[in-house]
Structure formats: structure tokens, C-alpha cells
């Protein structure tokens, strides 16, 4: 069964852009992507991008970028302002789904301010770093 | 332009390991895959697996899973590879390649590539 | 695992020929597949990439089609710097290369 793992890349010069990766390790075709935060914009959940294997992808603000950056892992970008970012930050969670077959559906989230690996799948440790 | 180097050729005895290394130059390490790809003499590419340096995370093709180990340092910008339990059928040209793709869909495919290892295996 | 599958497995032509090269997947890859030259003591190159795309500096006479499991390569008009042993590569579902094709004079 394939894992899901996120991480997110902040810019030490700029708190105000930083990046959301994430992948799925194992073997398994991959149909859709989507990743989505909660508590960064309001309280519910929101969709911040939306990328297929073959028709592209589509974001929403704050996400400025997605892309592929493997064929099995994904990248986005987000940019807001500075002190919206720090204030918001402590309280956000990324969520990234791969819709994969023959498996489903696979969720895997990434808690900024705790120290939990997430949802559903194993992650690697946070790893804040420059670009 | 981004350069793959590799180190120099390796003899090994059977039953031992190797860990070959593939240092990046030119470009940003951390957000591209590098695969890993070996050409026993006379025969044909085959896919080892490869890894996500920003995220340490590795994929393996199901021949070499639990054989072989994928790393990559950052702060040199460079990815290893290590096979163990080596036997004769492991001589082999070992290339590390770039995944590089379009970006906005999933299409990828192996440039640059490394000049390759040889790797011998002989008691 | 995917398995690709070329064919043939070699082939004689001369200068001037058309040349067609084969490789079909055991399942669908859409048009996730890549072909590659590789000439003695060298690393392999890209021809092709998504089926169908010319990687920049390749020369025209090489063309890709196909999609879903079966892809072909072609070279229209085989040059002396042509002989060489060319690989498909999917990359849909992790990567697998198909046996090869060596293109050797006539």
C-alpha cells in the first residue's frame, strides 16, 4: 500500500512564500492530486490546488504555483503577506491526497505546530529550510 | 547547465558492497529526482529506483528492493547509491540520471545523465 | 511492473533508410514514454520525451508516435552518426526501459 509523505520548505529571507511537497512512495498509478490547508485561510478546509497527470493544474489563492516536480510528488507554492504568514502559520495544516489506482485514496497532513507525522501515511520530519 | 559526476570505477568481491556516488553541479539539487540506472556488459538499461533529495524519499523497482539503498546529501549536492550482497551479476555500468520534466503534467524523463561507474564484481 | 517490450531486437539498414523501431507496453501508459539513443562506452540520450516531443537539438528525422501501448520510433532517413542501439522508457507508473533495438549497418 502506498505512503503519502508532505513537507514544507519555507524561504529564511521571506516568511512570506514557502512551498508545500508531497508524494507517494510505492508502486501505483496516479490519477489526481489535490492539496488543501485548514486554519490558514479560515477554519474550514481549502483547496489550494488540484493537479491531473494529463489535463494540468489548477491553484487557488494563496497558492501562487503547482507543478509536478517527479512523477510521483508535488509542489506548491503559496505567497501572503508577511504578517498574515506569521500569525497564520502556527495553526495550519497541509493536506495532500493522492487518488491512486488500484489503492484509492490516500491523505497524508502535516501539522505545523505539532510534532505528529500527520494523517493516514507515514511523513518524513518537518524540515524547514532555505531554498 | 546542470552536470552529473560520478566516482570512479570500483572492484568488489562477492558478498560485499559498493556505494557509488553522483554529485550534482549547475542547478538546484533538493527539487529534482535523481534515478539511478545500471547496463550489465552487452545488455540493456535497467531502472535501480531514485530519490527526492528534499524529502529524503525513495522509490525502488521491485528487483533491487531491500539491496539497494538510495541517499542524498544536500549540502554537497550529491546522491548515493549502495548495493549490497554483491554477486557477479552486479558488474555493471552504473549511471545516475536527472529526472527533469515538463512540470505542469506528469511526463518526465531521464537528462542530464552521469558518465557512469563501473562497477566489477570477481572474487 | 510494466513491462515494455521492444522490437526488433536488431536490425541492418543503410544510409538513407527509414527506420522504424517498435515498443509496446504489457498495460496502458497513456503517452508517458521516452526513447533514447546510446552508442558504445556512453551514456544514453534523449530522442524523445512524452511520446511524440523532439528533445531540443535532436535532429528532425527522428519522430515519435503512439500512445496508450504501442509507440514507434521512427528515422526517416538513417544518417552514418545513427548506428546505435536505441531504449523505450515509460515513466507512468515509476520507470521501466524496453530491451533495446541495435541499429547496425548494412
Known amino acids: 500500500s502506498p505512503e503519502v509523505w508532505v513537507q514544507v520548505q519555507m524561504e529564511a529571507t521571506n516568511l512570506s512564500s514557502f512551498s508545500v511537497h508531497c508524494g507517494v512512495l510505492g508502486y501505483s498509478l496516479i490519477s489526481l492530486v489535490t492539496v488543501s490547508c485548514e486554519g490558514f485561510v479560515d477554519a474550514g478546509r481549502t483547496k489550494l490546488a488540484v493537479l491531473h497527470p494529463e489535463f494540468g493544474t489548477q491553484q487557488w489563492a494563496p497558492a501562487r504555483q503547482a507543478h509536478w516536480e517527479t512523477p510521483n510528488s508535488v509542489s506548491v507554492t503559496l505567497t501572503m503577506g508577511q504578517s498574515k504568514a506569521r500569525s497564520s502559520l502556527a495553526n495550519t495544516t497541509f493536506c495532500c491526497e493522492f487518488v491512486t489506482f488500484p489503492h484509492g485514496s490516500r491523505v497524508a497532513c502535516r501539522d505545523l505546530h505539532r510534532s505528529d507525522p500527520g494523517l493516514s501515511a507515514p511523513t518524513p520530519a518537518l524540515n524547514l529550510q532555505a531554498d | 547547465q546542470v552536470q552529473l559526476v560520478q566516482s570512479g570505477a570500483e572492484v568488489k568481491k562477492p558478498g560485499s558492497s559498493v556505494k557509488v556516488s553522483c554529485k550534482a553541479s549547475?542547478?538546484?539539487?533538493?527539487?529534482?529526482?535523481i534515478s539511478w540506472v545500471r547496463q550489465a556488459p552487452g545488455q540493456g538499461l535497467e531502472w535501480m529506483g531514485g530519490?527526492?533529495?528534499?524529502?529524503?524519499?525513495?522509490n525502488y523497482a521491485q528487483k533491487f528492493q531491500g539491496r539497494v539503498t538510495i541517499t542524498a546529501d544536500e549540502s554537497t549536492s550529491t546522491a548515493y547509491m549502495e548495493l549490497s550482497s554483491l554477486r557477479s551479476e552486479d558488474t555493471a555500468v552504473y549511471y545516475c540520471?536527472?529526472?527533469?520534466?515538463?512540470?505542469?503534467?506528469?511526463?518526465?524523463?531521464?537528462?542530464?545523465w552521469g558518465q557512469g561507474t563501473l562497477v566489477t564484481v570477481s572474487s | 511492473d510494466i513491462q515494455m517490450t521492444q522490437s526488433p531486437s536488431s536490425l541492418s539498414a543503410s544510409v538513407g533508410d527509414r527506420v522504424t523501431i517498435t515498443c509496446r507496453a504489457s498495460?496502458?501508459?497513456?503517452?508517458?514514454l521516452n526513447w533514447y539513443q546510446q552508442k558504445p562506452g556512453k551514456a544514453p540520450k534523449l530522442l524523445i520525451y512524452?511520446?511524440?516531443s523532439l528533445q531540443s537539438g535532436v535532429p528532425s528525422r527522428f519522430s515519435g508516435s503512439g500512445s496508450g501501448t504501442d509507440f514507434t520510433l521512427t528515422i526517416s532517413s538513417l544518417q552514418p552518426e545513427d548506428f546505435a542501439t536505441y531504449y523505450c522508457?515509460?515513466?507512468?507508473?515509476?520507470?521501466?526501459f524496453g530491451g533495446g533495438t541495435k541499429v547496425e549497418i548494412k
Open positions: 549547475g542547478g538546484t539539487f533538493a527539487t529534482y529526482a
Open positions: 530519490i527526492f533529495p528534499l524529502s529524503g524519499t525513495a
Open positions: 498495460q496502458s501508459i497513456s503517452s508517458y
Open positions: 540520471a536527472r529526472d527533469t520534466g515538463r512540470g505542469y503534467t506528469r511526463h518526465f524523463w531521464f537528462d542530464p
Open positions: 522508457q515509460q515513466s507512468d507508473i515509476l520507470y521501466t
Open positions: 512524452a511520446a511524440s
